[in-house]
């Protein structure tokens, strides 16, 4: 996989008025890396590994960049004409990548109320607009504003591309990202399924990098794909990943099954625990009312395009 740096910024308007704050997250190699702390008005590393990337250097440069980008995005939102009453969001995602062959890619994407309406390849400066009439209108709005804005000249896009790559290379130079390996914690649980059956779930958490093999074996042989359910490999918010695999087995046959895990050249096998059946339940909280800008920002988070 290529090394990547991804900026994710969101600004909001309420009843046509652009709000003063902004949301910003930066992902390095797919991991939450930086976040803009609205209370302290500073870029903050996400976890110890992110702090290790810069070592004893300050995060002033990152704070300055994110603040500038947030300001630009607020101005862009202010120029979107069709803002009706209520809550609206403008999100910008900028990504740059360095591939194994040293080739690079950079792109920028704009979303309004969670819907993509404008993309740009920052190397070729080619713009792409989805077919929908709403997207076409929004794109025209934003492109006109960007053209008017003297800052958004041809050289500006080259600079955006170059700056992103420069930052990515700077982070990679620390070596922390390249050499980091965090082995997974593996946990096997069982839960009641139907009469005579139990569901066994194998969870791997807190691992890095994201590539992992997690599979159920019966008598040492991997079960076929269609008898297993896999969860996505997802960031867990600590600079590491998590995933799971589950299968249904006959009660009394637990001894035949093991969860096999392989990660970064290491492997392990994990038996099904015997004894009491644990019933696992998920509790989801639903928020219907939001009060104040902070709540709006928090609510907005779940709308993000990851």
């Amino acid at each position: 996989e290529p090394h990547s740096l991804r900026y994710n910024l969101t600004v909001l308007s309420w009843d046509g008025s652009v709000q003063s704050g902004f949301l910003a997250e930066v992902h390095l190699d797919g991991q939450p890396f930086l976040r803009y702390d609205r209370q302290k008005c500073r870029a903050k590393p996400q976890g110890q590994w992110a702090e290790d990337v810069l070592g004893n250097k300050t995060w002033d440069r990152e704070t300055r960049d994110l603040t500038g980008n947030g300001k630009d995005l607020r101005m862009t939102l202010a120029h979107i004409k069709d803002q009706k009453e209520g809550l609206h969001s403008l999100q910008e995602i900028r990504v740059c990548e360095i591939h194994e062959d040293n080739s690079t890619r950079s792109s920028q994407h704009f979303y309004y109320d969670g819907e993509l309406f404008l993309s740009q390849n920052l190397e070729t400066e080619e713009w792409t607009v989805p077919q929908s009439s709403r997207a076409q209108t929004l794109a025209m709005n934003v492109r006109n504003f960007l053209k008017e804005d003297a800052m958004k000249t041809k050289t500006h896009y080259h600079a955006m591309h170059a700056d992103c790559l420069q930052e990515l290379r700077r982070y990679l130079e620390s070596g922390v990202v390249l050499r980091r390996t965090v082995p997974p914690m593996v946990n096997v649980t069982r839960s009641e399924a139907s009469e005579g059956n139990i569901t066994v779930t194998c969870r791997a958490s807190s691992f890095y990098p994201r590539n992992i093999i997690l599979t159920w074996r019966q008598d040492g042989v991997s079960l076929s794909h269609d008898t297993q359910q896999w969860g996505d490999v997802l960031p867990d918010g600590n600079g590491t990943y998590q995933t799971w695999v589950a299968t249904r087995i006959c009660r009394g046959e637990e001894q035949r099954f093991t969860c096999y895990m392989e990660h970064s050249g290491n492997h392990s096998t994990h038996p099904v625990p015997s004894g009491k059946v644990l019933v696992l339940q998920s509790h989801w909280q639903h928020h219907h009312h939001h009060h104040g800008l902070n709540d709006i920002f928090e609510a907005q988070k779940i709308e993000w395009h990851e």
Partner: antibody, heavy 118, light 107 residues
């Protein structure tokens, strides 16, 4: 290339015990189970049990519980089967086998002949 | 325990022949059926797993088929090196059990 090298033939007295070894090479030993199979003279094959070299967990054929004990030494990538209280019924060729994770008994050792005789 | 029956204990065929060896399980084994070849020197090799999947390195003249309780191994073009005893084995239910073997000889 996956190889399972078994220990040489054994001639033992009734009532004694014997330890058959199976040294694995050509793959990561703790990745795959080791299975043990018995073949009495001129007869079919019987599955004895298997061991997971990673954690030492075993699953055995009820018929061989109390007769066979399966162990591993991870440091030397060697699996062992200890047979106790031997009788003439235990005279047989004993095979170890391993898997590639997709099929049972994928690779076999050359077999160890155990002869129980006074 | 599941009984695996190979009714033909020995079989004579000529080189180039198509040979089929049968195996029956005492109950449905859901295609968890493997075939092994044991040479006269005692060497054992996996040929076919999960009824019809050819193990890597095994010549394509070997094939397997079947379902439920009835399974078979076919050698499409018998060669001298195929002289051996063939065992079926079920992997569906513990304990794993083997057929009694079919010894293949040249006419």
């Amino acid at each position: 290339e996956v190889q399972l090298q078994q220990s040489g033939p054994e001639l033992v007295k009734p009532g004694a015990s014997v330890k058959v070894s199976c040294k694995a090479s050509g793959y990561a030993f703790t990745k795959y189970n080791i299975y043990w199979v018995k073949q009495s003279h001129g007869k079919s094959l019987e599955w004895i049990g298997y061991i997971d070299p990673y954690n030492g967990g075993t699953v055995q054929n009820q018929k061989f519980k109390g007769k066979a004990t399966l162990t591993v030494d991870k440091s030397s990538s060697t699996a062992y089967m200890h047979l106790n209280s031997l009788t003439s019924e235990d005279s047989a060729v004993y095979y170890c086998a391993t898997t590639d994770g997709y099929s049972l008994f994928t690779y076999w050792g050359q077999g160890t002949l155990v002869t129980v005789s006074s | 325990d599941i009984q695996m029956t190979q009714t033909t204990s020995s079989l004579s065929a000529s080189l180039g022949d198509r040979v089929t060896i049968s195996c029956r399980a005492s109950q449905d084994i859901g295609n968890y059926l493997n075939w092994y070849q044991q040479k006269p020197d005692g060497t054992v090799k996996l040929l076919i797993y999960y009824t019809s999947r050819l193990h890597s390195g095994v010549p394509s003249r070997f094939s397997g088929s079947g379902s439920g309780t009835d399974y078979s191994l076919t050698i499409s073009n018998l060669e001298q090196e195929d002289i051996a005893t063939y065992f079926c084995q079920q992997g569906n239910t513990l304990p794993f059990t083997f057929g009694s073997g079919t010894k293949l000889e040249i006419k």
